[in-house]
């Protein structure tokens, strides 16, 4: 317990102190006082440095004194032989004696009193930063006007913190500017603007004078700017050393001004303003921005339009433009949206053709369609090359998005017909010589394939059977062979409207307009043994002249047998119609004059006994195309004749081309169109 005074006596005082003793006294007076220790008697064995016996005075870690020997007072009016004064409120006194004393020593007597200390003057370190005021038992610090005492009750500072600036423009200066700023202060200013605005600080060099850095480059007084995780500074020295315009990229800025005890200068003054937060001027790849600006700032909205061939995709849908807003955080909204190449997808397949697997289906990619050659060709032109267009479609320069159409090549036999072995007016033939040849089994007759869906034949062949069974692709019409050939199923039979239907067809003498079309249920697949014959053109090039040669083929009657099993063919010249008129009808069913001859009929034959006969009806009279020698067209159809082995009459197909085209057009499926 602290006391204001007290007495200390060596052991056994005033008797001699014992040997080998160590005793200590802890003196404590109240806080704010020092200790004055007075020795009134001292009689301790003397030794060098008081090594044997001694009284030691210790203050904290410091030895204030060590006494031994004998002392007497120099002042007759005072008993004090030694005194100590310390400005602290604690003191320790230690007495030690060794194992022997050569004489009898009586020790020491002392007392202490608590004395007031002047904290303002008694210490090397001044306790107050500004004014120190001593009083008995303590002191207090005080400050000049406009300063305040910090919580440590020792340091004075100016009240320069806690200001929050929210206006979009403002000015801030150090305390007392331009007079010297206060020492030993920490000033904090906060700028807090609306989100979307960045604080921009502007300083002039001449508006800044802060105590310069030490030799190590450390600022003794400093100005620091803190914006989020970015720091500008510390700055110090004569004239502002930093950038005169500081764009903080933040709506919140803390300004911290720290000063030490010395070296006050005039300080600093700055201006700040809020700039709308800028957004980067990065253009989304493959796009254009509207409006175009040199700088985009908070709340600016741009329309981003993808370039042709690019789109923004989300799930299964896409868009070519979107809006983006410069946001309060300095970033664009919708920055995830990217203009990516349009994907045209896997190209559609086409009938009788193919498209190679594309390396890419993205904008600008190119694909090529081809037809199954040599049996099909591209009818609607365009070359088959398509590119992936900006609208996501595969587009051809000629056809646009329309797909190419592979249609059968007409009139080209895989093997040309050669008359090798003479067989009474004709030769054996192979179906590859006449791939357009169609076999009708009831009645036994022929026809000509003119495209995937249509067979051309004579009207008299189908007038009695509107659901004929037809076959293609076989040279032999033996039952076993037909089973392996392609059977065609009719959908509808179209007989020319000018063909007169009779009650008794056997008595017919008028074969005018002997032409019919059979529409098939399913398309015919073309190949080496099945392909169509061309139709005649409408120009005068396709007008037949006497002597023009044509080929006939069929499984009709020969000189040896009523029906042929294998295909026969012959090459015949066109003859004047009168030649046919002059031949006597073999088995007339009426008067010879009753037989009708019209310009819709072609007369051909008369050479070497080559002629068509019963069972060949409806087959084509194939003539080489005058404009393309590789092709044959159906100039005629086997119709009737006065006598086998002489001249025969053929329906003149050229006169019916309009009817054929109209009938096919009006009865086509959407797929064919």
């Amino acid at each position: 317990e602290p006391t204001m005074y007290g007495e200390i006596l060596s052991p056994n005082y005033p008797q001699a102190y014992p040997s080998e003793v160590e005793k200590s006294w802890d003196i404590e007076v109240p806080e704010g006082y020092g200790i004055h220790l007075y020795f009134t008697h001292l009689d301790i064995e003397l030794s060098e440095n008081c090594a044997y016996d001694s009284v030691q005075i210790i203050s904290g870690d410091t030895e204030e004194g060590r006494l031994c020997g004998q002392r007497s007072s120099n002042n007759p009016h005072s008993p004090i032989v030694e005194e100590f004064q310390v400005p602290y409120n604690k003191l320790q006194v230690i007495f030690k004696s060794d194992f022997s004393n050569e004489e009898r020593f009586t020790g020491f007597a002392a007392y202490y009193v608590a004395t007031d200390i002047n904290e303002c003057t008694d210490f090397v370190d001044v306790p107050c930063s500004h004014f120190c005021n001593n009083f008995i038992g303590g002191y207090f610090c005080s400050c000049p006007p406009e300063y305040f005492l910090h919580d440590d009750m020792k340091n004075c500072g100016v009240n320069c913190s806690g200001d929050v600036f929210t206006a979009l423009i403002g000015e801030i200066a150090s305390p007392n500017y331009p007079k010297p700023y206060p020492e030993n202060s920490r000033c904090e200013y906060q700028i807090r603007l609306e989100k979307g605005f960045q604080v921009v600080v502007t300083l002039r060099r001449e508006d800044f004078d802060v105590e310069a850095a030490d030799s190590a480059g450390n600022c003794l007084d400093s100005l620091v700017f803190v914006a989020g995780d970015r720091q500008f500074g510390p700055y110090c020295g004569h004239g502002f050393p930093g950038p005169l315009n500081i764009e903080t990229k933040s709506n919140a800025l803390d300004i911290i001004f720290q000063t030490d005890l010395t070296g006050q200068k005039k300080g600093w003054k700055l201006r700040y303003h809020g700039d709308p937060m800028p957004c980067p001027k990065e253009i989304t790849a493959n796009s254009v921005w509207e409006p175009a600006k040199a700088k985009y700032v908070f709340r600016d909205v741009v329309q981003i339009t993808c370039l042709d061939g690019f789109e923004v995709v989300e799930g299964r849908v896409g868009a070519t433009s979107f809006y983006s807003t410069c946001q309060s955080n300095g970033k664009w909204s919708n920055s995830k949206l990217k203009c990516q190449p349009v994907d045209c997808g896997i190209p559609e397949s086409i009938e009788n053709g193919k498209v190679e697997d594309p390396e890419s289906t993205l904008f600008g990619s190119v694909i090529r369609y081809t037809c199954e050659e040599p049996y099909y060709y591209m009818e609607n032109g365009g070359g088959g090359e398509y590119h992936c267009a900006g609208n996501g479609s595969w587009v051809n320069e000629v056809l646009g998005p329309e797909l190419p159409k592979c249609v059968p090549v007409c009139g080209v036999p895989r093997e040309p017909f050669e008359e090798k072995q003479r067989i009474i007016g004709g030769s054996d033939a192979d179906i590859k010589n006449f791939p357009w040849q169609v076999f009708f089994d009831n009645p036994w007759a022929g026809g000509a394939l003119i495209n995937e869906y249509w067979v051309l034949t004579a009207a008299h062949v189908v007038e009695g059977n509107r659901e004929p069974t037809m076959y293609v692709g076989s040279t032999s019409v033996q039952t076993s062979r037909l089973a392996k050939s392609k059977m065609l199923t009719p959908e509808h039979v179209f007989i020319h409207p000018g063909w007169k239907l009779l009650e008794v067809p056997e008595g017919r003498t008028n074969f005018d307009n002997d032409i019919a079309l059979v529409r098939l249920k399913d398309p015919v697949k073309m190949g080496p043994t099945v392909s169509p014959i061309c139709l005649p053109g409408t120009s005068s090039d396709y007008n037949l002249m006497d002597g023009d040669l044509g080929l006939i083929s069929g499984w009709g009657r020969t000189e040896k047998r009523d029906r042929a099993v294998r295909l026969k063919a012959a090459r015949l010249p066109v003859a004047p119609l009168r030649k046919c008129k002059e031949v006597k009808v073999e088995k007339p069913t009426a008067d010879a004059e009753a037989y009708v001859f019209t310009p819709n009929m072609i007369c051909a034959g008369g050479e070497k006994g080559m002629d068509s006969c019963k069972g060949d009806s409806g087959g084509a009279f194939a003539v080489q195309d005058p404009n393309d020698k590789t092709k044959f067209y159906a100039a005629g159809l086997v119709s009737w004749g006065p006598q086998c082995g002489t001249y025969g009459l053929y329906t003149r197909v050229k006169n019916y081309v309009d009817w054929i085209m109209k009938t096919m057009q009006e009865n086509s499926t959407p797929r064919e169109d």
Epitope: E314, Y323, T325, Q327, K336
Partner: antibody, heavy 116, light 107 residues
């Protein structure tokens, strides 16, 4: 297929906080924005804010600024919405939704009831 | 913030009717407007995006039009499953605001 599954209903006292989760499957949330929209009983839809899970950028509606925190955990493909200092008027169904061009997919909703 | 105002607030109609809902923005939102359908107890479903584009799987009887500040959602021939609440939403700039909704009821 794309799915957003939200955490279950919550009952909270005024002043408390609530954290709703939204687990995504069938897509990577880093490739989209994740939004939060709420709907008070018999009321309309109210947009609260969004997060870009790729970089944790967030934008909040001014009304919720300071009370709402939207976060995302890309490792679990989950977005979160935390609303603090709850009041009775915060009683609503909270929806998460994903977007690039539009809000094509929505969670099933989480009912948060604030009652003393 | 951009305010979105829908009209009417509610509307009664019969199956087969042609129905039009309008949405007005307090400022120009170009074509950054979407329409959503919400049935009781369900999450909203996207119908129309960018003012006039039908979202995949949405029946062709739904169509959207408009740009700037005035927009329209049209249902050409109402079906029983169309009775619901419809919301417009602008995605022109944040905050992405919704209209207050239009409740379509059976007459």
């Amino acid at each position: 297929q794309v799915q957003l599954v939200q955490s279950g209903a919550e009952v909270k006292k005024p002043g408390a906080s609530v954290k709703v989760s939204c687990k995504a499957s069938g897509f990577n949330i880093k490739e989209y924005y994740m939004h939060w929209v709420r709907q008070a009983p018999e009321q309309g839809l109210e947009w609260m804010g969004w997060i870009d899970p790729e970089n944790a950028d967030t934008i909040y509606a001014q009304k919720f600024q300071g009370r709402v925190t939207i976060t995302a955990d890309t490792s679990t493909n989950t977005a979160y919405m935390e609303l603090s200092s709850l009041r009775s008027e915060d009683t609503a169904v909270y929806y998460c939704a994903r977007s690039r061009l539009f809000f094509a997919y929505w969670g099933q909703g989480t009912l948060v009831t604030v009652s003393s | 913030d951009i305010q979105m105002t829908q009209s009417p607030k509610s509307l009664s109609a019969s199956v087969g009717d042609r129905v039009t809902i309008t949405c007005r923005a307090s400022q120009d939102v170009r074509t950054a407007l979407d329409w959503y359908q919400q049935k009781p107890g369900q999450s909203p479903k996207l119908l129309i995006y960018s003012a006039s584009y039908r979202y995949s799987g949405v029946p062709s009887r739904f169509s959207g039009s408009g740009s700037g500040t005035d927009f329209t959602l049209t249902i050409s021939s109402l079906q029983p499953e169309d009775f619901a609440t419809y919301y417009c939403q602008q995605q022109y700039t944040t905050p992405y605001t919704f209209g207050q909704g239009t409740k379509l009821e059976i007459k």
